[in-house]
Structures are given as C-alpha cells and as structure tokens.
Amino acid sequence: KKEDGESTAPTARPKVLRCKCHHHCPEDSVNNICSTDGYCFTMIEEDDSGTPVVTSGCLGLEGSDFQCRDTPIPHQRRSIECCTERNECNKDLHPTLPPLKDRDFVDGPIHHK
C-alpha cells in the first residue's frame, strides 16, 4: 500500500531518495542505505517455515507502482508499504501480515473418508 496519499501513477523525482535497507541492500548501497529514483519500502512476509521476515530497501521508479500495490498472492502471506516523503522514510513503516484465511490452516494432505 502507498503512504503519503500519493497518486497511483509514478512520477519522476527531481532528486535521489535515500532509503534504509535490510536483507535487500544492493551493491551500490553504503552503511545499509540505498539510493533510488522511486520509492523506499518495508515488507513483511513469511518464510518457508512460517516465520515473519521484515525486509526493507529501495524500489526503482520502473515497476514500483505495481510492486507497491500489495496485491494479494495466493498461498503467500505478505504485506508491503512504500513511501517517498523523506529520506529513510521506510524506517517508520510497519506493515503487518494479513490475517490467516481458513484455507491457510489446511497445510497437511487432504484426507478422504
């Protein structure tokens, strides 16, 4: 989801934006700070063992609108928030995992009578 009440169409920024990065730092980052022409993000998702993992970093302008839209993915619990209002704005983003749906509890084989 987008913060800041931004419009959905991404517009080119006149200046670089610095973001905190964690588990998602590109080679050109320095001291866990990355640079982008797009958005800062923070994302929470479950790993294979069901443990929530928080990732943060930079999204380039190209394709970031789609990535920040947080469309639900079947069988995957994750949530992403994006921001641009100031440098390292993603330090203050705290996305939460969407609630488990009933079908998500069925994780064993299907038993037939």
């Epitope: 006149p14 200046k15 670089v16 610095r18 590109p26 080679e27 050109d28 980052s29 320095v30 990355c34 640079s35 982008t36 022409d37 797009g38 930079c58 380039g60 302008l61 190209e62 100031r86 440098n87 390292e88």
Partner: antibody, heavy 116, light 112 residues
C-alpha cells in the same frame, strides 16, 4: 535561471573554524540536494558530502567526517558548510553544487586560504 | 572508493579536429535502478565546471551537438567532433552511482 552565489575568498588562521555559504536562487531550494566539492591545484575534485534541504538529511565522504558539517537555512535558500580545525591542507577552492541525480549547476567557488 | 581513470592527461589538438577522451571506472557504474550515473564536465580556467553530458550520453541543455558521450559498465568516452576555441579547458568525468561520488583527474584539451 539557476544561480548559486558564494563569497569569492576567505583567509583564516590555522586552527580556526569557518562557515562557508551558498545562496541558491532560480529554483525550489528543497527540490534538490546541495553538494560541496573541494578542488586543490593538482589534486583534482573531491566530493565532501551533500544535504537534502527538505529534511536536513546528510551524507558525507568518510574522509571529511569531523572536518565538514553541512546545514541549510530554507527560509533564505542558503546552504552552509562549517569547516573546523583548519590547516594548510584545507586551503582550496570549495564549490557548492545542485544535485538531483547528477550535478547540473555549480557555484563560482570560494577560495579558502589557511595561513598564519 | 570508485577510482575514475581518465586518459590522456593532456590532449593537444588542432581546431576543427576530432578529440576523444576516455574514462574508466574501477567498478561498474550501473546503478541498482538500471541507470548509469556517469557524467562529463568542462572547466575553463578560473571558472567552475559546466555540465556537458549526464548519464553517459545525454547532452545537457545548451550543449552543442558536437559533444557526444558513449560507453557502458566501466568504460566511457567523450567525443568532440570538431574542436572549437571555446572547447579548450579541462574535462572531468564523474560518477554518482557509488557513495562517495568521485571524479576523474581531468584531461586538458589544448591547442597543438
């Protein structure tokens, strides 16, 4: 048109501190970063650091941490660089420069002479 | 820090000649956004540098079309198709992909 005005020259004693200024006009001050760059004869150009006037966020070249401190006054669209504990090594021309994703406009530079 | 190596250090030319300046970086300048932040500046004696080319090959406003930039990754070139008297000075390449940003040592374009 974009203009970055800097004082032409400053002379200070070794050990002193000095605050250099850079007054911006012709654009929205908070829409671009302001960078500071050092040039010594025969030593080329060195990037000191940058400040985003919209939130006072700074990034420094490790080499100049403790030597340079960058600030801005958005009410007057002026950027400042404080240089401390000056030595002859700090004698140079100091440029301020507007930065978006690259430097597109430079100030005329302030020639700093550190001499007793 | 990324080292920017410019060659030659001095380039004597005759007016009307083509001039070519090379700039090599110690690391790739392709940013994680996909952009390549390599730029060229001209500094005339007693003046501040002026932007000529940004992001490898884009001419800045007001820059004559005799100036062109090319290259990718770590290897970049500035070409002046027909040198004019006003083109004389020191040319610098610069990268703003990696912090700290760095500059080449300069190429002095002078009359042969």
């Amino acid at each position: 048109q974009v203009q970055l005005q800097q004082p032409g020259a400053e002379v200070v004693r070794p050990g002193a501190s000095l605050k250099l200024s850079c007054k911006a006009s012709g654009y929205t001050f908070t829409s671009y970063w302001m960078q500071w760059i050092k040039q010594r004869p025969g030593q080329g150009l060195e990037w000191i650091g940058e400040i985003d006037p919209s939130d006072n966020y700074t990034m420094y070249n490790q080499k100049f941490k403790g030597k340079a401190t960058l600030t801005v006054d958005t009410s007057s669209s002026t950027a400042y660089m404080q240089l401390s504990s000056l030595t002859s090594e700090d004698s140079a021309v100091y440029f301020c420069a507007r930065f978006g994703f690259y430097v597109d406009y430079w100030g005329q530079g302030t020639t700093l002479t550190v001499s007793s | 820090d990324v080292v920017m190596t410019q060659t030659p250090l001095s380039l004597p030319v005759s007016l009307g000649d083509q001039a070519s300046i090379s700039c090599r970086s110690s690391q790739s300048l392709v940013h994680s956004t996909g952009n390549t932040y390599l730029h060229w500046y001209l500094q005339k004696p007693g003046q501040s540098p002026n932007l000529l080319i940004y992001k490898v090959s884009n001419r800045f406003s007001g820059v004559p079309d005799r100036f062109s930039g090319s290259g990718s990754g770590t290897d970049f070139t500035l070409k002046i198709s027909r040198v004019e008297a006003e083109d004389l000075g020191v040319y610098f390449c610069s990268q703003s992909t990696h912090v700290p940003f760095t500059f080449g040592s300069g190429t002095k374009l002078e009359i042969k």
